[in-house]
Amino acid sequence: MAKAAAIGIDLGTTYSCVGVFQHGKVEIIANDQGNRTTPSYVAFTDTERLIGDAAKNQVALNPQNTVFDAKRLIGRKFGDPVVQSDMKHWPFQVINDGDKPKVQVSYKGETKAFYPEEISSMVLTKMKEIAEAYLGYPVTNAVITVPAYFNDSQRQATKDAGVIAGLNVLRIINEPTAAAIAYGLDRTGKGERNVLIFDLGGGTFDVSILTIDDGIFEVKATAGDTHLGGEDFDNRLVNHFVEEFKRKHKKDISQNKRAVRRLRTACERAKRTLSSSTQASLEIDSLFEGIDFYTSITRARFEELCSDLFRSTLEPVEKALRDAKLDKAQIHDLVLVGGSTRIPKVQKLLQDFFNGRDLNKSINPDEAVAYGAAVQAAILMGDKSENVQDLLLLDVAPLSLGLETAGGVMTALIKRNSTIPTKQTQIFTTYSDNQPGVLIQVYEGERAMTKDNNLLGRFELSGIPPAPRGVPQIEVTFDIDANGILNVTATDKSTGKANKITITNDKGRLSKEEIERMVQEAEKYKAEDEVQRERVSAKNALESYAFNMKSAVEDEGLKGKISEADKKKVLDKCQEVISWLDANTLAEKDEFEHKRKELEQVCNPIISGLYQGAGGPGPGGFGAQGPKGGSGSGPTIEEVD
C-alpha cells in the first residue's frame, strides 16, 4: 500500500487552509461546504461544539461563545500589551490563569476555559478531518505554518496545538517561506535571490523579505500591521451601505445586529466580486423593517472607500526594505499571499511601487501558503518524485457540472476550468410538502437553464420522510477524480440514505468538438446581454473616471501645481457626476457616455496641462480619453443569511 501522505496546514488568523501533495501535484482540499478555506472559528453552544463555517455562520447569534483570533493569543502572556489591546475588541471573554490567557465560554450549560493552544488544536483537528475525508485514510503527519515574526514561544505553542490535534508536526515553517516554496523560488538555480512576500489576509498584513540561496531561506526583515486586512475593507463597505440605506430609506440599520450581519455577508461577497468585475450587485430581501435592499457598487467607488487603507500597505513595504538594508531594485521576486491581494488596486499600488515589476500571483493567494506547506511536507516525508521539484500543470474541467433545480435552472457545483481532481458539496432541499424523493439530473454546460445544457445522467433518491418543503437536507457531492470520472452522490441527511451515479468520459460525455461548440454557443447567447453589459460598462467607466479625477486633483503631490480655480472646477463637476450617478443608476448607455464626455471636457485640459512635459499622460496612466471602463456587470451577490 502506498505510504500515507503528509499534509500542509496554513493556520490563519481568520481562515485556515489544508493541502496535500500526491500524484505529482498539490491539491488544496475543500471542506464539507465545498470551501477551500475554513474559518478559524470555534463555537460552543448548549448542545454542541462547532468548528469552521458552522461556527462562523452563527457568530451573530452566539457572540460570547464563538472564539476566533486564537492566533493573536497563542504563545503570549496575559499581560502582553497585544493581548490587552486585542481583548477590548473581542465579544468573548479572556481570563488570566497564571499569566496565561484563557478563553472562557459557556458550553453545554457549564462555564469552560480553554487555552489558545486548545482552540487552535480544534481548528487543526478540523483541517485534519477535512484532509482525511478527502484522502480516505487517517492522517498524522503535517507541516504547519506560522508568521515569520512568531517567537519561539509562539512556535512551540503552535506545535503543541498540533500535538493536541493528534498530529505529528514534521516542522513549523514560516508563512512567507511556504509561499516562496509554492512558487519554486528555491529552485531557480540563479544564486542568491531577494524575495518580498506581501501577505494581506483577512485580519492581518505581513511583509517579509527573504533571501534564498541554494535552498536555504533566511528572513531578512518583517513588517506589517497586525490589524489590517479584508475585514477592514468589509467594514468600509458596510458603513457605505448603511449610509446609502439612510439616504434612500431614511432609516438607520446600524443598531440592528441581524441586518448588519446580513449586510456584512453581502459586502464580503461584493468585495470578492469586485476583484474580478468592475461592478457588484447586492440583493438583500427584507433587510430592515421589510425593506428590500437592492443596490450595487463599482470597483472605483470601493477603491475610493478604502483608498487610505490600500495606500497604507506600502509603509510596511518601505520599512521592511529599510530593515533589510535593500533598495527596491534589489528585490528579485514579489509574491502575493492572502485573499485581499486579489484586489486589483492593491496589486497596482505594489506593482507601481516596484516600477512595474511582475507579481507572482498564479497560485490562489489564499492557498499559496498551504500549497508550499504541502510541498514541504512531501519533501520531509521523503517524496523523491521529480514533481516535487517540477510541479505539473493542473488538469481542468472543460465545462461546468451541476444539477437541475426548481424551474429547470442549472445549478453548477463545479465551475468550468476548475482544476481536477476536485470535490464540491452543496445542500439542496425539497420543492413540495411531503415530497417523497428527489430526481438528481446531472448536466454539463454554461447555459443558465438545463434545457440548453447536456444531460449526463440522472438518478432518484427516494424514501425521504414526510416533511414540509424546504426542511429535508439533501447533500449532493460532485467528485471528479484525476481521470475525469465524475461521481455524483445524494444523501438524505436525516436518514443517511444515499444514492449515486458514476459518469465516465465515454458515457454521454461531450467530445472536444462539442465542448468547443457549447462554449461558442454560450458566447453567442451572452451577446444577447450585450446591451445591458454595455450600459453597465459605460456606467462603470463614468464612475471610475469621476473618482479617478477626484483623487487626482486631491493628490497632495499636486499642491501648487494646480490652481484653486481649476481644482474647484474639477471637483464641482466630479461631485455633480457622482451625485447624478447615485440618482441615475438605471440610466441608458448614451446618458452615461454623455456625462463621461462632459466630465472629460472639463478635466482633460486641466489634468493634461499638469503633466505636459512630464513624460506621461497623467495619473494612473489615463490618456485623453480616460479609462474606458471594465468588463461589464459583475455577478450578482445573492443573499446568504
Epitope: E576, S579, W580, E600, Q601
Partner: antibody
Framework: QIQLVQSGPEVKKPGASVKVSCKAS????????MNWVRQAPGQGLEWMGW????????TYGDDFKGRFTFTTDTSTSTAYMELRSLRSDDTAVYFC?????????WGQGTLVTVSS | EIVLTQSPDSLAVSLGERATINCKSS????????????LAWYQQKAGQSPKLLIY???TRESGVPDRFSGSGSGTDFTLTIDRLQAEDVAVYYC????????FGGGTKVEIK
Amino acid sequence: QIQLVQSGPEVKKPGASVKVSCKASGYTFTNYGMNWVRQAPGQGLEWMGWINTYTGEPTYGDDFKGRFTFTTDTSTSTAYMELRSLRSDDTAVYFCGRYDHAMDYWGQGTLVTVSS
Amino acid sequence: EIVLTQSPDSLAVSLGERATINCKSSQSLLNSGTRKNYLAWYQQKAGQSPKLLIYWTSTRESGVPDRFSGSGSGTDFTLTIDRLQAEDVAVYYCKQSYTLYTFGGGTKVEIK
C-alpha cells in the same frame, strides 16, 4: 472677444451632403464642448448633439444618429457638422454653440436649404 | 428622454408689466449632491441666434438685465420678466442639461 463664425448658406439637392463649419476664436478651443442645434423654418430649437473638442468624441441626440457626423480640427479651432443623404425636411438653420455651464456663445447660424 | 413642456405657447403683456413663462419637466432636474437644478433659459429674437439668459435655474448670465429672473425646483420652473420692455419681444426656450440636453417648445412673448 469670443466669437463663433459659421460658414455661409448652402443650397443642396436631396441625396447630397453638406458640411457646415464653425470657427472659434477668443478662447482655448479644446477647453469647451461644441454643441449643434437645428431650427427648422418657423419651429423651435432642437438639440442635435455635441462634440468633446479635447478628445474628438461626438455625442448624437436620438433623432440625429446615422446621417450626422461631428468633427473638429483643433489646429484651426474649427468644428464641423456634416449631414449626408439630405432630405427636404433637413431644411433648417444649423447653429453651433459653445458649452460651459450652458450654451453661452452661439454662431450666427447656417441656413441649409434642400430642394430639387 | 426628458421632455420639457412650456406654457403658454404665446403671451401678450403690456409694456412695464410682468411676463411669466412656465417650463415643466417630465422628471426632476435636481442634483441632490450639488443642490442645483440643471435648467437654463434662452432668448431668441427674430432672425437672430439664441442668447443665454439664465443657467442652473436662477443664475443670471453676465450682462443679462436683472429684470430677468428664474425660479423653481425639481420639475416645475418659471422665467419671470419684470417691467417688460420692447426689446424683450422674443421667443423664450427652456433647456435641461440634467441628462443629455433637451429644449422646450418655446414661448412667444409679444407686446399687448
